[in-house]
């Protein structure tokens, strides 16, 4: 029961986390810039991974996409890549984890298979979360180190044209969403990995023995399929008792006349 709860909670937490990573990646407010020296209207400038927006105090907002790849900074491209990898891994992890959930029955899937799938999805969630955290942190570092043109005054040398660069850049909401979402995905992944340990098939009480009926070439294995999985307590194939019953090794090693037709 605890294993199912841990697995289910891990799935839900990861689901929320991945939804957050997708939201952060699509958000425009990765970095924000306030302008105060404008006598016409207050202008609020903010940038995302895909486009830049300007909002006026009147409410008018204009957003334009980055239609060039060549002119984009390598760091921005790296952040994009990290976020996309995080989303893709997370999405695959979610798909795998749905089939791995203990509460969902799919055919005759064994607990060992579900355990493996849970572990796989858990690792995917962990990597996904780390990618998101790394991506957001790289972008935040770019802002902190004034990656965006930190020069106070730039003289172009053309007829006294002066460009005064404003650099009041602050962390946008997307950064915090990304950090939280990445953390949740990471936690969800850890929970899935923990749940995997509890899902691993335990040793059965069935004895892996073959009952040899005298005069008939019929092998009867109590417990059906599970008895032959090799997870029984009689793992060393020791002789249990005499009287027509032999271990599987013995049956194979010493064929009787009934074994051949």
């Amino acid at each position: 029961m605890a294993v199912t709860a841990c697995q289910g909670l891990g799935f839900v937490v990861s689901l929320i986390g991945i939804a957050g990573i997708i939201a952060a990646t699509c958000m425009d407010q990765w970095s924000t810039q306030d302008l105060y020296n404008n006598p016409v209207t207050a202008v609020f400038n903010y940038q995302g991974l895909w486009r830049s927006c300007v909002r006026e105090s009147s409410g008018f907002t204009e957003c334009r996409g980055y239609f060039t790849l060549l002119g984009l900074p390598a760091m921005l491209q790296a952040v994009r890549a990290l976020m996309i990898v995080g989303i893709v891994l997370g999405a695959i992890g979610l798909l795998v984890s749905i089939f791995a959930l203990k509460c969902i029955r799919i055919g005759s899937m064994e607990d060992s298979a579900k355990a493996n799938m849970t572990l796989t999805s858990g690792i995917m969630f962990i990597v996904s979360g780390l990618c998101a955290i790394a991506g957001v942190s790289v972008f935040a570092n770019m802002l902190v180190t004034n990656f965006w043109m930190s020069t106070a005054n730039m003289y172009t040398g053309m007829g006294g044209m002066v460009q005064t660069v404003q650099t009041r850049y602050t962390f946008g909401a997307a950064l915090f969403v990304g950090w939280v979402a990445g953390g949740l995905t990471l936690i969800g992944g850890v929970m899935m990995c923990i749940a995997c340990r509890g899902l691993a098939p335990e040793e059965t009480n069935y004895k892996a023995v073959s009952y040899h009926a005298s005069g008939h070439s019929v092998a009867y294995k109590p417990g059906g399929f599970k008895a032959s999985t090799g997870f029984g307590s009689n793992t060393k194939n020791k002789k249990i008792y005499d009287g027509g019953a032999r271990t599987e090794d013995e049956v194979q090693s010493y064929p009787s006349k009934h074994d051949y037709v």
Partner: nanobody, 121 residues
Amino acid sequence: QVQLVESGGGLVQPGGSLRLSCAASGSIFSIPVMTWYRQALGKEREFVAGISKGGTSNYADSVKGRFTVSRDNAKNTVYLQMNSLKSEDTAVYYCNAQASSFGWMPLSDYWGQGTLVTVSS
């Protein structure tokens, strides 16, 4: 890099009219606000009029009712229609644009080299 070029300045009699224009060119990503400033000889540069891309405009008290600012967003050009000109309007008129040359760069102040308007009889 964004370049601003002003034109339309010249000598005009008091009570006359002039139309200044300022065209932005170069690597332009976005120009939210375009503004006119002026600087008379021996005085500080002062705000005249400005207009945002959303259509919000503002004027200095000294030119209200006489000057009209307009903008052609498609051409990245701002105009200043000056009517009922007075001798105190004599100054070098500068065009200012708050713009970004690339979307991932912050908005910056770009200035033109100025055009001289002389109001004299």
